[in-house]
Every structure is written in C-alpha cells, then in structure tokens.
Amino acid sequence: MRTEAQVPALQPPEPGLEGAMGHRTLVLPWVLLTLCVTAGTPEVWVQVRMEATELSSFTIRCGFLGSGSISLVTVSWGGPNGAGGTTLAVLHPERGIRQWAPARQARWETQSSISLILEGSGASSPCANTTFCCKFASFPEGSWEACGSLPPSSDPGLSAPPTPAPILRADLAGILGVSGVLLFGCVYLLHLLRRHKHRPAPRLQPSRTSPQAPRARAWAPSQASQAALHVPYATINTSCRPATLDTAHPHGGPSWWASLPTHAAHRPQGPAAWASTPIPARGSFVSVENGLYAQAGERPPHTGPGLTLFPDPRGPRAMEGPLGVR
C-alpha cells in the first residue's frame, strides 16, 4: 500500500466571521487560502520493472501525488516528452487510451496512477538503460513529468523503486508569474488575517475552527518540500533509443535540469508484487510547465490548426509524437 501526501480539506468560512470582516473581504481570503493550500508542490513517481520471464519486457508504473484532477497522462521513452522522447501511450481519464508500439497494454490502475506493459520483441523493443517518462497534465497544477529507468546492474524481475523528484523546467517566466501571484495572494491573505486578528470578533463560536488553523497548515512546509533540498539525483543520458520510430528533435533552447529528491515518506510503495530491493533511484526528475489545463473531459480551446495539448517550442506536432492533434 503506498502512502500519498494528503492535502487537508478546507472548512467552509464560519458564519460568525461575516460580521467581523464583511462579506466582501471574507470571500477573497478564503479563495487565496485555498490557492495557498493547494499550491503545494505535486509529485510524479515512476517505477520501471523488467519482467523475469521476458528480459526485454518492461512494465512502467506512474502515479501523480497532487490534489488536482488529472486531465491527461503521456508516457514516453528516450527522454522527456517534448525533449526528444517518443510517445508510447496517452491516457485520458474519461476518453480512454491511445498507445504505440512497443506498448502492449496501457491502463489506469487508480484515478491517479497508470501502468504500461511494453513488448520485448522487435526492433523497437526497449533495453535496460532506456529512460521512461510520465507526464501528468492536471488542473490546477499544470503539467508535471517524471522519468526513471532500471539501474544498470538490476536483475530480471527486480524494479527500481518509485522515484519522485520535483524539478523546475521550461517556461520560467510563466512559472515565476504564477508563483508571484500566489505569493502575493498568500502575503495579502496573511495581512488580512493579521488585521482581522486585531479586530474584536463578535460571537466566535468556540467549537468552530478559527482561520488561524488553516493558515498555519497552509504555510507549514510539507515533508516533501522540506526534503526537496538534499542531494540531487543525476539525469541519465540514454544510449538506447527506439530503433524504428522517428524521434522528435530536442529543444532548440537551453535545457537545464535541477533535480531534487523527495522525502522517502512520500515515496509511494507499490503492492507486494512490486516489492523491490533497495536499488538506488537514478535518472528521476519531475518538471512543471507553464499553463493550466482544462478539467478532464473538457476540450482545450483551439489555437489554430496546429493545437497541441502541451506547450512546446518546436511547433504544433513535435510534442505529440504519434498522437495526431488537430
């Protein structure tokens, strides 16, 4: 059973507060507070397993540890999706699955995790040092990607443990912009709450929770974010590429990676069948990209004939790989 970081549920605003703060100033702090609480860093974990029966057969499992709703999952190999990787499968939480050789069976395991079985025969079959990546588009977090591969000396039947590790990538301006808005909002919220604290609050019912409790919760750094300041993992350069597919060209712009491992308590544990020896995790990273995604099932707005579901500097078709996007 794997443990997931839970975002605490927010209580609705107390009726007694309306007299103290007024209806107008009441709504904004709670909206901002919700943003602050849900602005915690989500994580993506990836687990790669080589089957003991077929040496070149792999099973990839990926999961999303976040409070948002997943709108699309893209599994790729040979590197991150949109950075030279080739799409293996695309999974939509309502509309289904599209998959590509050598993928044999992609499926949803839970509402926030997927698995993909890869065939072990043929020219396009994976090899032991292939990097597999999972990209989760979610609302409101945006797009998060993690990659992983088997350790070089792993025995058949063993798997690399699930390896989440948050990193920043891509559209910095957008990320900083959103972060700035959130930071400003949170500071403003703190200011409002401080101001409210110095005002006499009439008839606050003792049984109810005061807004200070959620505030403390919102601002307390999570284990994950505290732990995300230790030794970085190394990013893999994979020498094993898909043999039969045309791989997308790498990004033209600078590609930089700042990998940060995640606290072990947040490392999801798979079921007994996935139990693995403590192999050091390697080549795992997560990226957040600018742009918020529509709720699952909603059609993204058209931006012209070359719409892609994810932003990509190389043009409309480069990101999607085998998926044809109108």
């Epitope: 939480p93 289904g96 998959q99 039969t244 790989g321 044809g324 109108r326």
Partner: antibody
Framework: EVQLQQSGPELVKPGSSVKISCKAS????????LDWMKQSHGSSLEWIGA????????SYNQKFKGKATLTVDKSSSTAYMELRSLTSEDSAVYYC????????????WGTGTTVTVSS | DIVMTQSQKFMSTSVGDRVSITCKAS??????VDWYQQKSGQSPKALIY???TRHTGVPDRFTGSGSGTDFTLTIDNVQSEDLAEYFC?????????FGGGTKLEIK
Amino acid sequence: EVQLQQSGPELVKPGSSVKISCKASGYTFTDYNLDWMKQSHGSSLEWIGAMSPNNGATSYNQKFKGKATLTVDKSSSTAYMELRSLTSEDSAVYYCARWDSNSWYFDVWGTGTTVTVSS
Amino acid sequence: DIVMTQSQKFMSTSVGDRVSITCKASQIVRTAVDWYQQKSGQSPKALIYSASTRHTGVPDRFTGSGSGTDFTLTIDNVQSEDLAEYFCLQHWNYPYTFGGGTKLEIK
C-alpha cells in the same frame, strides 16, 4: 472537404498478399492518426490498428499482428495496409478512419475497400 | 478484451417514434464510447462521441447517454433516413472493440 478515398475492390488468391490504400485530402495529413477497421460480411466491425503519419508509429490489435502491416507515404498523403497469407476469413470490407485526438473518436471514414479471397 | 454487447440485433419502429438502442460494456469504460451509423452499402459515419457529444452536423434528435458500463443511443422523432445499422465502440482499452450492431427498421 475532408475525404479518405480508398483503393478499389480486390480479388485475390489464398496465400497471397494485398496492399490497399487510403488517400487523404482536405486536411493536413500528418495532423491526424489513421486507423483501420475490418467488417466481415454480415458481422460487426473490428479494429485492426492505428498509424501515425507524423512519425510512422503503429499500434496493432494482437489478433491482426502478423496479418496486417500499416505504412504511410507522407509525400502522397496516403496510408497503406498490407494483408498477407490471405485466407477466406480475410474476405471483408476494410475501412480507414481518421482519429480526432482532441475529441477522441473517428470523425471521418474512408470509402471502404472490398477484399475477396477466392481460388 | 472488452466486450461491447448490443443485445438487440434488430429494432422496428415507425416514423415519428422514439427509439433507444443500448450497448453494454463488459467492464467500466467511463465515457470512452462512441456511436456510429452505417447505412446499407455505405461507410460508417460518426454520430456521438464521448458517450453524449454529437458529432458536427448530426441532428439533435440523436442523443447519447450513459457512462461506466451502460450506454444508450436515443433517436427522437425517427425519420425514414434513420434506417441504418448503429454500432457502439469503446476506446477505453486496447484493443478497441465494437458492439455487434443494431439494425433499425422502419415500419
């Protein structure tokens, strides 16, 4: 107007191979996947596989692996399906269909190609 | 493989009537179900996708509903041009599978 024009009917001998085509027009060929379906006389449809004209990636129904091979010629906006080791079981109408990956469905279907396997 | 069952092979109706064609999936497929119409001697045409969204140009007398395992295509005010065979398709899992089809006959 978006169209998928398929090649004409084929009468072939058992054990031989046949290659049928699906020529796309009215849209950017590489922007959409093309899938293939089989409809045997008096029975339902079966999904054979999918092809990405963009990069040549394929996906097959396990039942048709070794039977069907999907290829593409970007220069002529044409997708092909080759059927080999034909038997009477392969006699059917074969359709190509365009997959709309925004809305996830087959929005346009080809005209269909009738393949008859007979000695 | 996911089995899509259209229990009624044939349905008879009159012009102006309302008819419901059902499709049952052997496992949960969320809303990953489409409906296609095929008139005699023609290629299939898209009617409904994502269980309930009408394809462009499809008359609003065609309505799709359901999610999970049970899906229904309802035709209100049936017209003579609706004489056709109707197929459901699931694309929740590989391989994609079609229902056996329901032929609509006009009395």
